[in-house]
Interface confidence: low
């Protein structure tokens, strides 16, 4: 029977700069029941606080709700693991909420084959930003990426869409069924997960762009 091994805070993420969650990996438990607590203070303050919510983010997590989230200060946090034989502490982690934003995936992905009479046919892809993100005030610049592939293909074709919420693709294989997904990232943060795939059947008479 031993004191617990050193835990590690390995990830902090915010969906929108208004709340955030951090997760830690426990060290070895020393063969005994082990309690974990996350404590933090804000840069420039000496007062230590304990994690306000160990539930919302799931096991080994700390969730900071709106009233605990500040874009204006760096958080300095550590996890303490304690059992009957003693304690161990994680390294301190410095967290700036602005840099840990990982938005939800874009919404309402719509895909359509367009075949104008006078021009080459194309695939038209349209989506909406995630609902939690406030784009109107300039708080966020969201960038988008699209990926698509024929259903049975191994490789994805990736297109960067910038800030647009719609995109045209010309070069596609006629008669194939395609999967299409989109994801987004803020200027200072992380890519979201890919949106659920939308399927589209490309007509056999779709002319590939030359």
């Amino acid at each position: 029977q031993l004191p617990p091994g050193k835990p590690e805070i390995f990830k902090c993420r915010s969906p929108n700069k208004e709340t955030f969650t951090c997760w830690w990996r426990p060290g070895t438990d020393g063969g005994l029941p082990t309690n974990y607590s996350l404590t933090y203070h804000r840069e420039g303050e000496t007062l230590m606080h304990e994690c306000p919510d160990y539930i919302t983010g799931g096991p080994n997590s700390c969730h900071f709700g709106k009233q605990y989230t500040s874009m204006w200060r760096t958080y300095i946090m550590m996890v303490n693991a304690t059992n009957q034989m003693g304690s161990s502490f994680s390294d301190e982690l410095y967290v700036d909420v602005t840099y840990i934003v990982q938005p939800d995936p874009p919404l309402e992905l719509a895909v359509e084959v367009k075949q104008p009479e006078d021009r080459k046919p194309y695939l038209w892809i349209k989506w909406s930003p995630p609902t939690l993100i406030d784009l109107k005030t300039g708080w966020f610049t969201l960038l988008y990426e699209i990926r698509l592939k024929p259903e049975k293909a191994a490789e994805w074709e990736i297109h960067f869409a910038g800030q647009q919420t719609e995109f045209k693709i010309l070069s596609l294989h006629p008669g194939q069924k395609y999967l299409v997904q989109v994801r987004c990232k803020p200027d200072h943060g992380y890519w979201s997960a890919w949106s659920p795939a939308t399927f589209i059947q490309i007509p056999s008479d779709f002319t590939m762009n030359d």
């Epitope: 709106k66 602005t98 960038l143 910038g162 200027d187």
Partner: antibody, heavy 118, light 111 residues
């Protein structure tokens, strides 16, 4: 260190257009909003608009929408503001200022004094 | 647009005394529990200089005699003790939403 360099002055005829420049250095130009602010002699400060060099996205105050056009040249880390159909009301000092990601103006150019006169 | 009203328009304060400048917003500039109100100092022939951001946080290199307070719609900038170098124009500015707006300014002088 962060610097925003603006020409000291411009003299332009009424009815003409002018393109004011703001050359940025000492930071990643494409990662911060660039704002433009107008100050008439002895008056307060007016926000004209901003541009995000990483994407070209812009916002304008409604009253400057038909007057000002904001652009950037990322290869030279330079922001531009074109002012059109100039009148004496446009005579002012124009500042470029960097928008910190926490939404305040942290660095300012020295300002360009624009004089509209025949 | 959010309108910011500063008072007084001008103020004369003795050296060593306290100067208080107020700024009232036409609607709340709070979001997510934080106040998007900033204060700037401007001296003749110079660009504005950031003093306070987010209502109460001092900008880089700003002396401790400058302090900001307030939330919602009512904010104030305090300077204490007043020094000769503090003679300048002071502006409040909100960055809660586009268009960013400034107060009309307060001229602070030595009495």
């Amino acid at each position: 260190q962060v610097q925003l360099q603006q020409p000291g002055s411009e003299l332009v005829r009424p009815g003409a257009s002018v393109k004011l420049s703001c050359k940025a250095s000492g930071y990643t130009f494409t990662s911060y909003w660039m704002h433009w602010v107008k100050q008439r002699p002895g008056q307060g400060l007016e926000w004209i608009g901003n541009i995000y060099p990483g994407s070209g996205s812009t916002n304008y105050d409604e009253k400057f929408k038909s007057k000002a056009t904001l652009t950037v040249d990322t290869s030279s880390s330079t922001a531009y503001m074109q002012l059109s159909s100039l009148t004496s009301e446009d005579s002012a000092v124009y500042y470029c200022t960097r928008g910190n990601y926490r939404y305040y103006f942290d660095y300012w150019g020295q300002g360009t004094t624009l004089t509209v006169s025949s | 647009d959010i309108v910011l009203t500063q008072s007084p328009a001008s103020l004369a304060v003795s050296l060593g005394q306290r100067a208080t400048i107020s700024c009232r917003a036409s609607e709340s500039v709070d979001k997510s529990g934080f106040s998007f109100m900033n204060w700037f100092q401007q001296k003749p022939g110079q660009p504005p200089k950031l003093l306070i951001y987010a209502a109460s946080n001092r900008g880089s290199g700003v002396p401790a005699r400058f302090s900001g307070s307030g939330s919602g719609t009512d904010f104030s900038l305090n300077i204490h003790p007043m020094e000769e170098d503090d003679t300048a124009m002071y502006f409040c500015q909100q960055s809660k939403e586009v268009p960013w707006t400034f107060g009309g300014g307060t001229k602070l002088e030595i009495k």
